[in-house]
């Protein structure tokens, strides 16, 4: 077992006066046994903020069930923050003994009494949309102070201009929220695209927060179909392929119909991915023309991502192929599943 480390993931925490500050601390091991204590400041004059083992700390609550042996989260919440609470807080692990001995300290979390915006959350439309459609994305960030804040939208690094932003409330408040809606026109090449909402605030020291949305979760690129007849593979057998190109997402079901009757249904599995993130897929049907007296209308029907089916047909001439005596079967195969259906 590796030696225990005390992890304080936040180098700094900024909190508005009157609110609660959560100071995160986790340990990487359950060994050694012993209490956790929180201090403000370092050295002999450090101030005890919380002792897991004993004492009364009315403003401090533990975030998780810290009395249990399996607990590794020793984060605390300090209520009713005032400017006097500013400082660096250390989470310190002790080894059980008489007396308990200090084992390891976290790196510290600096608490400043002002408020950063929360990480921007970008959300897109509930339903997918197809290229050439305009969709709306929203970006929200909360809990910041002071009120002055800058929000920008980007698509693949290019700044967008069609958006509206509101900061609430209008009057004085302990903290503020920002809400912005941007309009984005989808293109067929947007599967790999990202929409980014960037928030800059004085508390962020010039390092803006970003929220992202992948257009892969928003876009639907419908497939194009092409049905072609391949050269005859063997006597009386014709290979017909249906090329399904440039579709996204992958969820696709293909049905072959012979003269309007369902011949086979399959789901796209082994697809190839294009550079733009869309997919191609090919299905093929081996038709025994000797099983047909008349011309055959072969139809490739595709249902993509739950949308209404699209289809493409191909007329197969059988007049040049006299039917063999005693045969009334059609053999069908897929490239990955060689089987005859009688």
């Amino acid at each position: 077992e590796e030696e225990l480390q005390v992890i304080q993931p936040d180098k700094s925490v900024s909190v508005a006066a009157g609110e609660s500050a959560i100071l995160h601390c986790t340990v990487t091991s359950l060994i050694p046994v012993g209490p956790i204590q929180w201090f403000r400041g370092a050295g002999p004059a450090r101030e005890l903020i919380y002792n897991q083992k004993e004492g009364h700390f009315p403003r401090v609550t533990t975030v998780s069930e810290s009395t249990k042996r399996e607990n590794m989260d020793f984060s605390i919440s300090i209520s009713n923050i005032t400017p006097a609470d500013a400082g660096t807080y250390y989470c310190v692990k002790f080894r059980k003994g008489s007396p308990d001995t200090e084992f390891k300290s976290g790196a510290g979390t600096e608490l400043s009494v002002r408020a950063k915006p929360s990480a921007p959350v970008v959300s897109g439309p509930a339903a997918r949309a197809t290229p050439q459609h305009t969709v709306s994305f929203t970006c929200e960030s909360h809990g910041f102070s002071p009120r002055d804040i800058t929000l920008k939208w980007f698509k693949n690094g290019n700044e967008l201009s069609d958006f509206q932003t509101n900061v609430d409330p209008v009057g004085e408040s302990v903290s503020y929220s920002i809400h912005s809606t941007a309009k984005v026109v989808l293109t067929r090449e947007d599967v790999h695209s990202q929409v980014i909402c960037e928030v800059a605030h004085v508390t962020l020291q010039g390092d803006p927060l970003r929220g992202t949305a992948n257009l892969s979760e928003t876009i639907r690129v419908p497939p194009t179909l092409e049905v072609t007849q391949q050269p005859v593979r063997a006597e009386n057998q014709v290979n017909v392929t249906c090329q399904v190109r440039k579709f996204y997402p992958q969820r696709l079901q293909l049905t072959w119909l012979e003269n309007g009757n369902v011949s086979r249904t399959e789901t796209a599995s082994t697809v190839t991915e294009n550079k733009d993130g869309t997919y191609n897929w090919m299905s093929w049907l081996l038709v025994n023309v000797s099983a047909h007296r008349d011309d055959v209308k072969l139809t490739c029907q595709v249902e993509h991502d739950g949308q209404p089916a699209v289809s493409k047909s191909h007329d197969l001439k059988v007049s040049a192929h006299p039917k063999e005596q005693g045969s009334n079967t059609a053999a069908e195969n897929t490239g990955s599943n060689e089987r005859n259906i009688y």
Epitope: I31, V33, K53, E54, T67, K68, R69, E70, K96, S98
Partner: antibody, heavy 118, light 107 residues
């Protein structure tokens, strides 16, 4: 519900062996130190052994070299292999979870009786 | 090994009484002391850990105090179900050791 259930007790002759089991349920077994405690009839409690979450073990002098504690986290099971048994080992054996952050016992099993007699 | 000595060994009290049991360690154990209750034919039940912290589900009529070598368990108002044997235990270092027990009987 957090539960510990001991089994494997019985009558054994002096010098014989016995293996006790403790089946744990209702908690993340691998995250707790586990202990065996025994109690002779009409007597007090005596701590017998511990196995830590990392597999480290400790015993008092009275059983050291004769008893072996082990655990099988995948089966949520604790064991006590008792060899070279003596009449003085006759007792009810309890398994207990070091369930508090400081390894204080919080949950006990119902116990299993071990009788060493010729 | 750390020796734990309980007193008294037995105690008679009436319903509603407040009783105190003491436990002394042969050396400083900080506050790594637990108290257990045991009724005849039953497994021990955990009451208190780190000298004064109540285990989950234990009624607040039980309280513990002390640090170093001297500790006490107090039951504020005895009820019939409280008559049992009580044990203290140090768990600051191995081997963990128990007191010899205090039998609390109805007067």
């Amino acid at each position: 519900e957090v539960q510990l259930v001991e089994s494997g007790g019985g009558l054994v002759q002096p010098g014989g062996s016995l293996r006790l089991s403790c089946a744990a349920s209702g908690f993340t077994f691998s995250s707790y130190d586990m202990h065996w405690v025994r109690q002779a009839t009409g007597k007090g409690l005596e701590w017998v052994s511990v196995i830590g979450i990392a597999g480290d073990t400790y015993y008092p002098g009275s059983v050291k070299g004769r008893f072996t504690i082990s655990r099988e986290n995948a089966k949520n099971s604790l064991y006590l292999q008792m060899n070279s048994l003596r009449v003085g080992d006759t007792a009810v054996y309890y398994c207990a979870r070091g369930g508090s952050w400081d390894d204080a016992f919080d949950i006990w099993g119902q116990g299993t009786m071990v009788t060493v007699s010729s | 090994d750390i020796q734990m000595t309980q007193s008294p060994s037995s105690l008679s009290a009436s319903i509603g009484d407040k009783v105190t049991i003491t436990c002394r360690a042969s050396q400083d154990i900080n506050n790594y002391l637990a108290w257990f209750q045991q009724k005849p034919g039953k497994a021990p039940k955990s009451l208190i850990y780190t000298a004064s912290s109540l285990q989950s589900g234990v009624p607040s009529k039980f309280s513990g105090s002390g640090s170093g070598t001297d500790f006490t368990l107090t039951i504020s108002s005895l009820q019939p179900e409280d008559f049992a044997t009580y044990y203290c235990q140090q768990y600051v270092s191995y081997p963990y050791t128990f007191g010899q027990g205090t039998k609390l009987e109805i007067k």
